[in-house]
Interface confidence: low
Amino acid sequence: ERLCHPCPWEWTFFQGNCYFMSNSQRNWHDSITACKEVGAQLVVIKSAEEQNFLQLQSSRSNRFTWMGLSDLNQEGTWQWVDGSPLLPSFKQYWNRGEPNNVGEEDCAEFSGNGWNDDKCNLAKFWICKKSAASCSRDEEQFLSPAPATPNPPPA
């Protein structure tokens, strides 16, 4: 009997989406590219549950991890990579005293139990997100999981 795999191999399923936690490090812009290369997006957070899930993954692995959020377009105006604004209620997820823009810190990362702004040119881990496969019998998702890793050697 064929099994349904809503996410590619080494990706994690959560509430209808698939997430890839990288094992290598890139700067913020290259992290965006790495996600695009596998048909995904540097993670855009849309719910409190999703935030809690991702923060837990990041803190458990004790890694500083890029998310798809920056104020590169306009200092102090935080925007997700899909163009949506950072809603005011998201403010509670910044670590105390953040974002502080010390030394042109324009990109957001998971850091400890909250968010931090850091320099976009620093190499960090990253998280990609894409919609999970529907697994209807008409589609080709009834396959053995094939490795799909957005982890080419660092550029």
Epitope: I45, K46, S47, A48, Q51, D82, G83, S84, P85, L87, P88, S89, F90, K91, Q92
Partner: antibody, heavy 122, light 106 residues
Amino acid sequence: QVTLRESGPALVKPTQTLTLTCTFSGFSLSTSGVSVTWIRQPPGKALEWLALIDWDDDKYYSTSLKTRLAISKDTSKNQVVLTMTNMDPVDTATYYCARTPSGSYGRYFDLWGRGTLVTVSS
Amino acid sequence: DIQMTQSPSTLSASVGDRVTITCRASQSISTWLAWYQQKPGKAPKLLIYEASSLESGVPSRFSGSGSGTEFTLTISSLQPDDFATYYCQQYNSYWTFGQGTKVEIK
């Protein structure tokens, strides 16, 4: 039990300043993520958002009315006050206060007061 | 500012009917959309948030769908208590309401 109650004058004269108070219970405006907002509804017409204040005192105003509005909070009294200057008969409406829930990413309004009708007439 | 347009403005229906109300945003709002029900002389009541999440205590006959610029509120089987005015509201960028849809008895 969470409740919100609006209070203020039922009648104001044109050019006067309206001051409305929202008194709430069952939640605290010092809780991270909580906001209180003001919305109005002219008789027989649609809802119009006016202003919102966050737990950390950030304030947001309607683009078309921001020069006339001011919102403030008194956390110890569990109150939010809205002032609206230079009142005009077209400002006749039921004024509601509402809250956004803690821990929600979206800023929707989950609980509302009953509203208070304000008539602007000389 | 983001504009919200609801259709129809008025909808005549009977008890048991399946009712659908549409809300369109002037630009993409992702899924940052809420639906409210309002009865005469009463405050609005939250039904749906984040386009499709049902508020606690709201009957399951209410459902929401959509993303981007087009959204729908569906009442699967209209009940006597459902005759009211329904408003959509975006909260992607500040806050804007639609002009309302009145559901009346046919």
